[in-house]
């Protein structure tokens, strides 16, 4: 599976579209996860609505939003207020029971505004790889200052 490389500017939004065979993936929820290592776990960031017929509704976790057009066969993920810490290798997944089929691998590269040296704060990655949803995310306004926020849901 080829990796798509996408670039985004820090502070702006980045939209990712993953296309799939609408018939083959009929009735399946979609998910967006971050790969923690080359052969390591892919931590769930966000997944589409639990009721498949409502998959078109936007579902949010922190600054990441997912919505699925099940007729067109396109799942759209939006990374809002992109930060340097959002850079990484991600997967669009189609969920079938406990199994996840990779639809697309996406490498997100975050380009800094040379006049604005900002970065994300520490990200809490759950030790278990089953779910990333509800993870604690801390943001900061500069590389050397860290501010904690309560967990997102």
């Amino acid at each position: 599976l080829n990796t798509t490389v996408l670039q985004g500017m820090a502070g702006q939004s980045l939209r990712v579209s993953c296309t799939y065979d609408a018939l083959k993936h009929w009735g399946r929820r979609k998910a967006w996860c971050r790969q923690l290592g080359e052969e390591g776990p892919c931590q769930r960031v966000v997944s589409t609505h639990g009721v498949w017929l409502l998959a078109f509704l936007k579902k949010r976790n922190g600054s990441t939003v997912i919505a699925d057009d099940t007729l067109a066969g396109t799942v759209t993920i939006t990374l809002k207020n992109l930060q340097a810490g959002d850079a990484g290798l991600y997967q669009c997944q189609s969920l079938r029971g406990r199994e996840a089929e990779v639809l697309q691998k996406v490498l997100v590269e975050v380009l800094e505004d040379p006049l604005d040296d900002q970065d994300a704060g520490d990200l809490w990655v759950p030790e278990e790889s089953s779910s990333f949803e509800g993870a604690q995310v801390e943001h900061s306004t500069s590389r050397n200052q860290e501010t904690s926020f309560p967990p997102t849901s």
């Epitope: 923690l36 850079a87 290798l89 590269e109 380009l111 030790e127 590389r143």
Partner: antibody
Framework: EVQLLESGGGLVQPGGSLRLSCAAS????????MAWVRQAPGKGLEWVSS????????YYADSVKGRFTISRDNSKNTLYLQMNSLRAEDTAVYYC????????????WGQGTLVTVSS | DIQMTQSPSSLSASVGDRVTMTCKAS??????LAWYQQKPGKAPKLLLY???NRFTGVPSRFSGSGSGTDFTLTISSVQPEDFATYYC?????????FGQGTKLELK
């Protein structure tokens, strides 16, 4: 097999310049962030600089900011570190490393090249 | 910047021993921590990332735990090839700072 091979180290006088190179093979170079980490003789590890897979953004430790420049040539699978205004405290083994997808940990390292700054 | 402090600075063990070394961050870093092993004259090697994930080829006797500010690297049964210096590193958010290292020596 991932391989990183540094070159360009040597003896240089304080205030001088040196350019380190790192030839990468065994992986899709343009898909990875890269970094330099150094280790002074008998001391611990210190992150020096990183850059994104396209080279569009660069990051530096405060100790080298304004003096060192990291860059890459994806067509040649090569990473560079231009070091100017060198000081005695820059004496170290410099390691070329592959940084996992912007996560700040280094999954593969070169064998290192020694830079000695002395008069 | 967040400081990483390792303890002890050195420890002695025999083959087969269970050893534990710690890494303390000056601020909460979630579980954004990596561990490396370095032998004299060699480049460091990645052992664990995000606190507890073993890198490719790393034996199961190496394990990591902790979160927030306190982290532990455990070698369940030390082997001859494990005598080396171990470094922790705060990851995910720059600057990526390392601890000063813990040297594991043969008793």
């Amino acid at each position: 097999e991932v391989q990183l091979l540094e070159s360009g180290g040597g003896l240089v006088q304080p205030g001088g310049s040196l350019r380190l190179s790192c030839a990468a093979s065994g992986f899709t170079f343009s898909n990875y962030y890269m970094a330099w980490v150094r280790q002074a003789p008998g001391k611990g590890l210190e992150w020096v600089s990183s850059l994104t897979n396209s080279g569009g953004s660069t990051y530096y430790a405060d100790s080298v900011k304004g003096r060192f420049t990291i860059s890459r040539d994806n067509s040649k699978n090569t990473l560079y570190l231009q070091m100017n205004s060198l000081r005695a405290e820059d004496t170290a083994v410099y390691y070329c490393t592959r940084e996992w997808a912007g996560s700040g940990y280094f999954d593969y390292w070169g064998q290192g090249t020694l830079v000695t700054v002395s008069s | 910047d967040i400081q990483m402090t390792q303890s002890p600075s050195s420890l002695s063990a025999s083959v087969g021993d269970r050893v534990t070394m710690t890494c303390k961050a000056s601020q909460n870093v979630g579980n954004n921590l990596a561990w490396y092993q370095q032998k004299p004259g060699k480049a460091p090697k990645l052992l664990l990332y995000y606190t507890s994930n073993r890198f490719t080829g790393v034996p199961s006797r190496f394990s990591g735990s902790g979160s927030g500010t306190d982290f532990t690297l455990t070698i369940s049964s030390v082997q001859p090839e494990d005598f080396a210096t171990y470094y922790c590193q705060r990851i995910y958010n720059s600057p990526w700072t390392f601890g000063q290292g813990t040297k594991l020596e043969l008793k």
